[in-house]
């Protein structure tokens, strides 16, 4: 109409998908009677009548809005339920009297996208690629309108950068009218990006204002060539024979190159390749002194066939050789002297110790042990221990047995044994001496003899208890070239008064033997009974 003012901007109504939009007809009473209003939707500049109000009563027109419109607020407001993205358009109300006026409402529809789904290139990115490669994708599903995407690296937004960073975004419209956004980050990465954290952020608007959603952070597999190769040895520190030693080849490239480990041969001055396991680790188990030497690692890039060599590493497997003692089998007369000398080789300084075998008592710190005025009790074992003090657990020992010449020496002179008539008795008798004695018994029975050690012998006799035996007792005699000696076993009948209340529950036979050095008693083997007195 000529001279009429330009149409005012429509009123803005913002709603989320699925909610109800309240379209309030803003005509004043002077502009029209709200009890007689027509509502139109405008799409691509085409008006479609969707609702009529007559005498305050509403009536939907057939079509897409038929089921979703109702009147509220005494007819002044049209409610549109279950809003969809397709509802984003202009709605207008037109009053009929006194003259036709209209009021326009712009409906804006919003929907937050789902959490962004970020995916990393499953094959990884080589740093030497000629062009930017697809690093990761970010997908934001079912948003409205189209959200904006921002990529971040280590918390900083990524900007387009010619030939270095390119962000390629596209969207698809779902049947619901919602948008799915896909953004592809293409970049030329460098070695330092191997630890970089990437994520994407979706920025979107709702009636309540601006919002954003972040994806999880991801790292990208970055491939870069090896520049440096080195060897690592485990365990660190001083190594000793018997240890499990791992020699590992390491490189700063990804993926790791193919490795080979070689050891220098001192005699041929050539490197000999060692057999590694599947991970390229050389395992020395148990480590021996022969494993000592100069090791090197060679790394091969199988694509370029270029090889790199590590710095050589000296490996020292510390050892102690077999310990030698001289004399090796010493024999001495009582009252004489003896010097025992211990020798061993090692890769480190050695400490020597002499110990008494039976008691572990330290007799001497040093390689030489001097013994004077030897007594019979001095016979037995002496142990030389050669150890490296700086390496715990690195030691070798050698045992030597000293024999003192002398006639047989009994473990006990006499003993009382409790017996029952007609029982089979198991008696034992122990003697020592040098030369080693033999033992005989003065009664018939089954005797067996066993060496306890080169100077000591134990004889056992199985015999039936008879009245005669009870009367005479039993004697064992030990003899060697230098003399003889006898022990007596007195047999005593058990009577009930000697039994304790619980002793009848013990029916097993037991044997106990004692060392002659402590002059403890050797017992016969029989029903275990209380000891009526000390045996001497």
């Amino acid at each position: 109409v000529p001279g009429e003012a330009e149409q005012p901007a429509p009123e803005l109504v913002e709603v989320e998908v699925g909610s109800t939009a309240l379209l309030k007809c803003g005509l004043s009473q002077s502009q029209g009677n709200l009890s007689h209003v027509d509502w139109f939707s405008v799409h691509k500049e085409k008006r479609t009548l969707i609702f009529r109000v007559r005498q305050g009563q509403g009536q939907s027109e057939p079509g897409e809005y038929e089921q979703r419109l109702s009147l509220q607020d005494r007819g002044a407001t049209l409610a549109l339920t279950q809003v969809t993205p397709q509802d984003e358009r202009i709605f207008l109300c037109q009053g009929k009297r006194p003259r036709s006026q209209e009021y326009r409402i712009q409906l804006r529809v919003y929907k937050a996208p789902e959490e962004p789904n970020i995916q990393v290139n499953p094959l990884g990115i080589p740093v030497n690629s000629k062009e930017p490669e697809e690093v990761a994708t970010c997908v934001g599903r079912n948003g409205y309108p189209i959200p904006q995407v921002i990529w971040y690296k280590n918390g900083r937004p990524l900007k387009e950068e010619k030939n270095r960073v390119h962000i390629q975004s596209s969207q698809t419209v779902e049947s619901s009218g919602l948008y799915t956004l896909q953004s592809i980050l293409k970049a030329q990465l460098v070695k330092e990006d191997k630890d970089a954290q990437f994520y994407c952020e979706l920025n979107y608007r709702l009636p309540s204002g601006n919002h954003m959603k972040e994806s999880r952070e991801v790292t990208v597999p970055v491939f870069y060539p090896t520049e440096k190769v080195w060897l690592e040895v485990e365990p660190v520190g001083m190594l000793k024979e018997g240890d499990r030693v791992e020699i590992r080849c390491l490189a700063d490239g990804n993926p790791p190159p193919h490795f080979s480990i070689s050891k220098g041969n001192p005699s041929t001055r050539e490197a000999e390749e060692e057999t590694t396991n599947d991970n390229g680790v050389l395992v020395l188990e148990p480590a021996r002194k022969e494993h000592s030497g100069r090791y090197e690692c060679q790394a091969w890039n199988l694509d370029t066939m270029i090889s790199l060599l590590s710095e050589p590493q000296e490996l020292l497997v510390n050892y102690v050789s077999d310990v030698r003692v001289s004399p090796a089998a010493p024999e001495r007369q009582e009252g004489s002297s003896l010097t025992l000398t211990c020798e061993a080789e090692s890769s480190q300084d050695l400490e020597f110790q002499w110990l008494r075998e039976e008691t572990d008592q330290v007799l001497e710190r040093g390689p030489v042990l001097q013994l004077h005025d030897l007594k019979r009790e001095a016979g037995g074992g002496y142990r030389c221990v050669a150890s490296v003090p700086s390496i715990p657990g690195l030691n070798r020992t050698q045992l030597v047995k000293l024999a003192i010449f002398g006639p047989p020496w009994m473990a006990f002179k006499e003993r009382k044994v409790w017996v029952k008539e007609n029982m089979v008795l198991n008696l034992s008798c122990e003697a020592s001496g040098h030369p080693r004695p033999t033992i005989s018994w003065n009664v018939n029975g089954t005797a067996s003899e066993g060496d306890q050690d080169p100077q000591r012998v134990l004889s056992t006799l199985n015999v039936l208890v008879t009245p005669e035996l009870l009367e005479t007792g039993v004697e064992c005699t030990a003899s060697n070239d230098l003399g003889k000696n006898t022990s007596i076993l007195f047999l005593e009948l058990v009577n009930l008064t000697t039994l304790t209340p619980d002793s009848n529950t013990t029916t097993g036979l037991s044997t106990s033997t004692a060392s002659p050095h402590t002059r403890a008693n050797s017992t016969s083997t029989e029903r275990k009974l209380p000891e009526p007195e000390s045996r001497g």
């Epitope: 995916q119 290139n121 499953p122 690629s129 000629k130 062009e131 490669e133 697809e134 999880r216």
Partner: antibody, heavy 116, light 106 residues
């Protein structure tokens, strides 16, 4: 529309080299990566190798030393060579387009038999 | 390498039945999973990508669900043309496929 077609020999002898060609249309090799996948008779699918839109090459470490993948962008072709063929390499060989990380279009495959 | 275990290896169902195939990853692969349909002599077909997104042109009776290590392909109403072998594939780290599920009509 997007199509991929594999071509190459149907029969190769043990120890020989296999050369397969994948000819693509409906997209550019500088926009999408292409992979080779195989399926031995009665067995599952197995990824072999890929070449990216930027020309970077990737191989399954199980065959790495035997494989070469290359492309000719002007001919829209991706070529796979596999040396030292063995009867266990008898399979249907497919090429597939990446979009960008999953395979959205495949060729119909070519059956390669390794036998003397 | 990530292993994908698919079950069952085969199944037989009637037309109209709801069919479910599962795929389990040896580690978390988030939503980097696709489902394919293979028919002898035909071009393999992408059904589902990103675990639950239906590829354009695929009937809506196919659907995918799951994330992390456990995934499912569902055919809501089995049709005769759905007879095929179905494979899952992870693309989180490298590419590995499940062992396949052969679907037949009873």
């Amino acid at each position: 529309q997007v199509t991929l077609k594999e071509s190459g020999p149907v029969l190769v002898k043990p120890t020989e080299t296999l050369t397969l060609t994948c000819t693509v249309s409906g997209f550019s090799l500088t926009s999408n990566a292409v992979s080779w996948v195989r399926q031995p008779p009665g067995k599952a699918l197995e990824w072999i190798a890929a070449i990216s839109s930027g020309g970077s090459t990737y191989y399954n470490s199980a065959f790495k030393s035997r494989l070469t993948i290359s492309r000719d962008t002007s001919k829209s072709q991706v070529v796979l060579t596999m040396t030292n063929m063995d009867p266990v390499d008898t399979a249907t060989y497919y090429c597939a387009r990446h979009r960008p990380f999953y395979f959205d279009y495949w060729g119909q495959g070519t059956l390669v038999t390794v036998s003397s | 390498d990530i292993q994908m275990t698919q079950s069952p290896s085969s199944l037989s169902a009637s037309v109209g039945d709801r069919v479910t195939i599962t795929c389990k990853g040896s580690q978390n692969i988030y939503k980097s999973l696709a489902w394919f349909q293979l028919k002898p002599g035909k071009v393999p077909k992408l059904l589902i990508y990103d675990a639950n997104s239906l590829q354009t042109g695929i009937p809506s009776r196919f659907s995918g669900s799951g994330s992390g290590t456990d995934f499912t392909l569902t055919i809501s109403s089995l049709q005769p043309e759905d007879v095929a072998t179905y494979y899952c594939q992870q693309y989180y780290s490298g590419y590995t496929f499940g062992g396949g599920t052969k679907v037949e009509i009873k």
